[in-house]
């Protein structure tokens, strides 16, 4: 029976990624019943993209090394809608590392996936970023602006925000 | 079940490139970080690197840094691997394989293997 094999492929496909991710949140995509897309529980989920609020306090390297550890990044964010999305899981009196970084401390800044980076689809906060020194970014809020991203010293642990690709199973 | 076909070995004289490919069969590719690992005659599966889900992450062994380049295209479902300043002791039949998530080193952690591409270098 075609439904039984397809389910017992999947349930195979879950337990190889159980000791990462426990629990797993699917949905089917469209009206094609082949096509589950998943998320870890109790990650969230936009387009096709798992977002995870990260609330230890760590340095950027090492917040990096924590997302990559669950199969992520920390979060490349490409558009203003997945950014006001990002910002309904925030906490305004925080602040989140993301996956931009300017190791040279020339201002080329770099997403951690390599996706180009585009001036044209930036949040900085106005008058950011400032300082040659602060080589990592982060978002914050503030209340003249509200959410907007600064660059900070990469070494001062923050919050972060970890990205994955959806898990398709 | 992910399927891999490694292309591209061949024969290449010391101080020359080639460029590994590995197809993989279905779009769960980007469920998976990837890796390439290598068997020289008697001896055992040896690391050689590996790559994040994203390609964000990559990992190399010490014998091929700087010497190699390991690439994924997600939108094609392929992976790749730049060896250039190819030496004698880089002979070996080359496998790519996959495991889930997060990216490894061990062998044991990978689901999934080619049948492998050979590499012989000549001096």
């Known amino acids: 029976n075609f439904m039984y094999s397809k389910t017992v492929k999947r349930l195979s496909k879950l337990r190889e990624y159980q000791q990462y991710h426990p629990s797993l949140t699917c949905v089917m995509e469209g009206k094609d019943i082949e096509d589950w897309s998943c998320c870890p529980t109790p990650w969230t989920s936009f387009q096709s993209s798992c977002y995870f609020i990260s609330t230890g306090m760590q340095s950027w390297t090492k917040s990096q090394k924590n997302c990559s550890v669950m199969g992520a990044d920390l979060v490349v964010i490409n558009t203003r809608e997945e950014q006001d999305f990002i910002i309904q899981n925030l906490k305004r009196n925080s602040s989140y590392f993301l996956g931009l970084s300017d190791p040279g401390g020339r201002r080329h800044w770099q997403w951690v996936d390599q996706t180009p980076y585009n001036e044209n689809v930036t949040f900085w906060h106005s008058g950011e970023p400032n300082n040659l020194d602060e080589r990592c970014a982060i978002i914050n809020f503030r209340s003249s602006e509200e959410w907007g991203w600064n660059d900070i010293h990469c070494h001062v642990p923050q919050k972060s925000i970890c990205k994955m690709k959806k898990i398709y199973i | 079940q992910v399927q891999l076909q490694e292309s591209g070995g061949g024969l290449v004289q010391a101080g020359g490139s080639l460029r590994l490919s590995c197809a993989a069969s279905e779009r769960t590719f980007t469920n998976y970080a990837m890796g390439w690992f290598r068997q020289g005659p008697g001896k055992d599966r040896a690391f050689v690197a590996a790559i994040s889900r994203s390609g964000s992450s990559t990992s190399y062994a010490d014998s091929v840094k700087g010497r190699f380049t390991i690439s994924r295209d997600n939108a094609e479902n392929i992976l790749y691997l730049q060896m250039n300043s190819l030496k004698p002791e880089d002979t070996a039949v080359y496998y790519c394989?996959?495991?889930?998530?997060?990216?490894?080193?061990?062998?044991?952690?990978?689901?999934?293997w080619g049948q492998g591409t050979q590499v012989t270098v000549s001096s």
């Open positions: 394989a996959a495991a889930p998530l997060v990216l490894k080193t061990t062998p044991g952690a990978y689901n999934y």
